[in-house]
Amino acid sequence: SAHAHPRDSCPLGPGRCCHLETVQATLEDLGWSDWVLSPRQLQLSMCVGECPHLYRSANTHAQIKARLHGLQPDKVPAPCCVPSSYTPVVLMHRTDSGVSLQTYDDLVARGCHCA
Amino acid sequence: SAHAHPRDSCPLGPGRCCHLETVQATLEDLGWSDWVLSPRQLQLSMCVGECPHLYRSANTHAQIKARLHGLQPDKVPAPCCVPSSYTPVVLMHRTDSGVSLQTYDDLVARGCHCA
């Protein structure tokens, strides 16, 4: 099969490889204070860390990328840590007609992989 | 809306920002010569280049990431250039019962964005 087994143990040491991390951000940090009312502070899960060879490969393409990066590091970048899924979050925001609740499906990461 | 307008013009100069690039790879390069018969060489489209602020943002999360990277570059990584879609490709490969054609949907990138 085209799929080599993606690795799940980090060869670089604890916390160094691609993982989910919580980042606190205020509405001011995000530049949203003029149109979002709540929450005033968001707990944003983001994907951080390195992607060593075959660690949490997103798919066949990522495995190829990892291999070719080993062969041609100047030409092919290493895979990088990006969201594999998202957690929906509700924001209370201003509209022309008042305020409303709106769900954002692509705002907070729920899982990460190397793509 | 949570979506600021993603930029499509590269502020870093031609060819520096996230884009699709073709990489030639042999079956030997990929470590596939023992199980894939054809094609003997693949034209692999891969996503390469940098992701400056709001360039080809994949979604709201990527826009937040770009903003927070500007505020906390040591804690929040910049968005990175990954496939937004794939082109299916067929491989002739060995199986226990002979050789057969199999389509891989996630092998060759067709478009790129910053995630």
């Epitope: - | 018969l37 054809s38 082109t87 299916p88 002739m92 050789v99 054609l101």
Partner: antibody, heavy 118, light 107 residues
């Protein structure tokens, strides 16, 4: 499940143009590596390859017939077409379309028979 | 054009026997040769790819061999359902060309 089915006029008179259609399912001609060929077989004789169209619209023809052949595709409707101009009695044959992945004809249609007669 | 020659138009064999169908290319085609089986009244069916690789689902009594200019399709333990015509084909260069076919008759 991959299937291909040829359709054509059945009978033509000499000098007319033959239009063949290959309707297929179970694969896409937008997949890199895929192609469809037309092959013919006069009754009781061998196989003659006529033309090939690749996923990227690259086309190849048998040089002995090239001036008379036109192959084309409609990827969205899963059809491949072949036109042969100025048919003659020598074009009487069963016409097959076949799927290829990297040059191997792994699935064939049932064939459509053409008789050229005045 | 590359000419593929199957010198034996007919071969006669018995159930349980082993038979070898040969094919000669007019120039070197590497291993870019396929074999097809056509039963009476049916369309051809792929048997062998790249000279020696059996296509998925093809019984293992069918084996292909050869490279360069000389190729062989061997059928071990011939069965009555193997009554068919066998064609070789080169895909080393355009135009693709087929051999003239070898009809296998079961005694």
């Amino acid at each position: 499940q991959v299937t291909l089915k040829e359709s054509g006029p059945g009978i033509l008179q000499p000098s007319q143009t033959l239009s063949l259609t290959c309707s297929f399912s179970g694969f896409s001609l937008s997949t890199s590596g895929m192609g469809v060929s037309w092959i013919r077989q006069p009754s009781g004789k061998g196989l003659e390859w006529l033309a090939h169209i690749y996923w990227d619209d690259d086309k190849r023809y048998n040089p002995s017939l090239k001036s008379r052949l036109t192959i084309s595709k409609d990827t969205s409707s899963n059809r491949v077409f072949l036109k042969i101009t100025s048919v003659d009695t020598a074009d009487t044959a069963t016409y097959y379309c076949a799927r290829t992945g990297w040059d191997f004809f792994d699935y064939w249609g049932q064939g459509t028979t053409l008789t050229v007669s005045s | 054009d590359i000419v593929m020659t199957q010198s034996q138009k007919f071969m006669s064999t018995s159930v349980g026997d082993r038979v070898s169908v040969t094919c000669k290319a007019s120039q070197n085609v590497g291993t870019n040769v396929a074999w097809y089986q056509q039963k009476p009244g049916q369309s051809p069916k792929g048997l062998i790819y790249s000279a020696s690789y059996r296509y998925s689902g093809v019984p293992d009594r069918f084996t292909g061999s050869g490279s360069g200019t000389d190729f062989t399709l061997t059928i071990n333990n011939v069965q009555s359902e193997d009554l068919a015509e066998y064609f070789c084909q080169q895909y080393n260069s355009y135009p693709y060309t087929f051999g003239g076919g070898t009809k296998l008759e079961i005694k």
